[in-house]
């Protein structure tokens, strides 16, 4: 099939005292090969500081996955979710407050 770029959605949730968990979800993409990782100050975080979900079919012939990491509250702006798919990339910052935002990466 043809390439379908991911929808990327970044959310934040309260973790332990002084920390938040930021989660980056990519959905509705094809083919299934994707890079999804958190970057701090422009550089990818090490694998052991991130948690990944499996790349799973979402029932529409496309796929979904996620990556999460725990960060200090107040440091959110230093972090960006980096997505790479089919030779294209996009970057997705952490929203302020408790809001969330959808980004659609267009190839």
């Amino acid at each position: 099939g043809s390439t379908v770029p991911p929808m990327v959605n970044v959310t934040r949730s309260e973790a332990s005292e002084g920390n938040i968990t930021v989660t980056c979800r990519a959905s509705s993409f094809y083919p299934r090969n994707i890079i999804l990782t958190w970057r701090q100050d422009g550089v990818s975080l090490s694998h052991d500081t991130q948690q990944w979900g499996d790349v799973l079919p979402d029932g529409n012939g496309t796929y979904q996955t996620w990556v999460a990491t725990r960060i200090c509250r107040g440091e959110e702006q230093r972090f960006t979710c980096y997505m790479e798919h089919s030779g294209n990339h996009s970057t997705h910052p952490v929203p302020s407050g408790n809001s969330h935002h959808h980004h659609h990466h267009h190839h």
Partner: antibody, heavy 117, light 107 residues
Framework: EVQLVQSGAEVKKPGSSVKVSCKAS????????IEWVRQAPGQGLEWIGA????????NYNEKFKDRATLTADKSTNTAYMELSSLRSEDTAVYFC??????????WGQGTLVTVSS | DIQMTQSPSSLSASVGDRVTITCRAS??????LAWYQQKPGKSPKLLVY???TLADGVPSRFSGSGSGTDYTLTISSLQPEDFATYFC?????????FGQGTKVEIK
């Protein structure tokens, strides 16, 4: 010291192409995205796109998607921006910049591209 | 695309004056805003990022503030070397967009 050094000024004919280079030094080239921005004479700044020098993956402004090609050579720590089908409105200074998280922290000195018949 | 409306487009001021430049985004950019100073024939120089964080080496007379859609750059006491053009830029979503610039001239 982080440095981005760009190639020299170019004069091009309408319909031709130009390739501007941006040589990085003072940091790990493949770790950071390189962004490209242009500034027409007396005008504001316009984002062209970005490249991950490590993988070659790109992100283009839709306005430039059909005419701009971003590449990078890891062996020489150099990023390139090629713009095709040049027209007079493409006369501008072209800048490369390093993406540090969520802002551009270092910029090249700029390359003036003049499109004239 | 997010539009960045910067005002004023130019201003005349004297050394020692307090100068305020504003930037309004067409949508919430979650404080992902940078301010740059540019002098003729030079590349932009980063002054402020994340709306209010001063870049390394930038004098404390510069300050940034704002959230949501409205942002301000303030120069508390204008110095001779501050006469230049100032731009804002949003980093919330691509295409990254810039304000049209504010030229600060000598009165």
């Amino acid at each position: 010291e982080v440095q981005l050094v760009q190639s020299g000024a170019e004069v091009k004919k309408p319909g031709s192409s130009v390739k501007v280079s941006c040589k990085a030094s003072g940091y790990a080239f493949t770790n950071y995205l390189i962004e490209w921005v242009r500034q027409a004479p007396g005008q504001g700044l316009e984002w062209i796109g970005a490249i991950n020098p490590g993988s070659g993956a790109t992100n283009y402004n839709e306005k430039f998607k059909d005419r701009a090609t971003l590449t990078a050579d890891k062996s020489t720590n150099t990023a390139y921006m090629e713009l095709s089908s040049l027209r007079s409105e493409d006369t501008a200074v072209y800048f490369c910049a390093r993406f540090l998280g969520n802002y551009f922290d270092n910029w090249g000195q700029g390359t003036l591209v003049t499109v004239s018949s | 695309d997010i539009q960045m409306t910067q005002s004023p487009s130019s201003l005349s001021a004297s050394v020692g004056d307090r100068v305020t430049i504003t930037c309004r985004a067409s949508g919430n950019i979650h404080s992902y805003l940078a301010w740059y100073q540019q002098k003729p024939g030079k590349s932009p120089k980063l002054l402020v990022y994340y709306a209010e964080t001063l870049a390394d080496g930038v004098p404390s007379r510069f300050s940034g503030s704002g959230s949501g859609t409205d942002y301000t750059l303030t120069i508390s006491s204008l110095q001779p070397e501050d006469f230049a053009t100032y731009f804002c830029q949003q980093f919330w979503t691509t295409p990254y967009t810039f304000g049209q610039g504010t030229k600060v001239e000598i009165k």
